[in-house]
Interface confidence: low
Amino acid sequence: LVKTRRDASGDLLNTEAHSAPAQRWSMQVPAEVNAEAGDAAVLPCTFTHPHRHYDGPLTAIWRSGEPYAGPQVFRCTAAPGSELCQTALSLHGRFRLLGNPRRNDLSLRVERLALADSGRYFCRVEFTGDAHDRYESRHGVRLRVTAAAPRIVNISVLPGPAHAFRALCTAEGEPPPALAWSGPAPGNSSAALQGQGHGYQVTAELPALTRDGRYTCTAANSLGRAEASVYLFRFHGAPGTST
């Protein structure tokens, strides 16, 4: 029988023979995970425990900031004998369990990363049946979210009121980029309505395209800029677009 213990970075410190239980509580997480804003990241977490063949109810929890005390960002519960961990909490719907807690794996996937997601995350498992035991990673995994240069993900021309047309431009980046429209109107630019950003995505609308020609959307943040264009040709009242 083997007892293992790991340090903050998950390196094996010692193994020594001893009597039951076969394992003691431990959690293995990497020291750091790096990802770019807008992408997804996986926070690995595996554990060992002293309760052989535990098949009772369990709860898997991830929290941010501080161990034991920080706010929960994810929680799921598995019924006795079930391998399905039913999600009870997923902050902003961006967290989901990748691992199988029944197989000692609490790994978590975080979608649509923003810079604000940077920080420490701590995994925790609770055996809520007869075993009545629980454990939480002490050191946690540090998630580093790096900034992302702007990228225009959609640009389009749509029918507007009174036979007019409007243009939409959606870009992503972290920090969220500033959007600007330019076009064939006098002064070569038109005022854009900056829409609500969703996480790392920003949308700007040009509400009335008054002339045919090329309309360009420019997205810029501290890491760079991107631009894309649409062309408006009013043949028989139908718009044509090109990027």
Epitope: K3, R5, A20, G65, E66, P67, Y68, R124, R134, Y135
Partner: antibody, heavy 120, light 108 residues
Framework: QVQLVQSGGGVVQPGRSLRLSCAAS????????MHWVRQAPGKGLEWVAV????????YYADSVKGRFTISRDNSKNTLYLQMNSLRAEDTAVYYC?????????????WGQGTLVTVSS | QSVLTQPPSVSVAPGKTARITCGGN??????VHWYQQKPGQAPVLVIY???DRPSGIPERFSGSNSGNTATLTISRVEAGDEADYYC???????????FGGGTKLTVL
């Protein structure tokens, strides 16, 4: 720096009540479980009670269950211990302590202690 | 409920190594924490989770835990190490924290 400053101790007659306070500063009080630990004169440390970071979970030593109530006011960064039906054997120095680490928590910061004497 | 047994006293000469034990049924499966308390002062955490040392605690303090015994080891003992030492665990069956009875370390 982390500080836990206690108040409220004193001499009280058996059967009476007393409330201890522990004012926290230098850390995010609302993110930590907090404990009370006591030490009778010339004796060892005895754990008394714990309250979770949000106040939703409380556990007590058998010796004080039903008589003592642990509570917290996160808006005031303060921990409390309401002691009712006091007995002579409750005479001790009472410490508040912050829980650090995992659920198998240790006490990483302690208050200075306040003496409670139950005597007629 | 966990019961932790410590020797009431341990004596050691300056510069030597002191070992303070904490006995408990299968204590090796639990995380053990150690505190130092000097007269008239609040306890101070010296070892947590069996063998980890808080910042500010000298490297002379170390811990181990296996089987039915956890051990606090103080190497190159100094006069300033004279104090009471307590072990502590979490009792999963009751959600209580449990202290050992304490050991008085005397530096001869």
């Amino acid at each position: 720096q982390v500080q836990l400053v206690q108040s409220g101790g004193g001499v009280v007659q058996p059967g009476r009540s007393l409330r201890l306070s522990c004012a926290a500063s230098g850390f995010t009080f609302s993110s930590y479980a907090m404990h009370w630990v006591r030490q009778a004169p010339g004796k060892g440390l005895e754990w008394v009670a714990v309250i979770s970071y949000d106040g939703s979970n409380k556990y007590y030593a058998d010796s004080v269950k039903g008589r003592f109530t642990i509570s917290r006011d996160n808006s005031k960064n303060t921990l409390y211990l309401q002691m009712n039906s006091l007995r002579a054997e409750d005479t001790a120095v009472y410490y508040c302590a912050r829980e650090g680490g995992s659920y198998y928590g240790y006490f990483d910061y302690w208050g200075q202690g306040t003496l409670v004497t139950v005597s007629s | 409920q966990s019961v932790l047994t410590q020797p009431p006293s341990v004596s050691v000469a300056p510069g030597k190594t002191a070992r303070i034990t904490c006995g408990g049924n299968n204590i090796g499966s639990k995380s053990v924490h150690w505190y130092q308390q000097k007269p008239g002062q609040a306890p101070v955490l010296v070892i947590y989770d069996d063998s980890d040392r808080p910042s500010g605690i000298p490297e002379r303090f170390s811990g181990s835990n296996s089987g039915n015994t956890a051990t606090l080891t103080i190497s190159r003992v100094e006069a300033g190490d004279e104090a009471d030492y307590y072990c502590q665990v979490w009792d999963s069956s009751s959600d209580h924290r449990v202290f050992g009875g304490g050991t008085k370390l005397t530096v001869l």
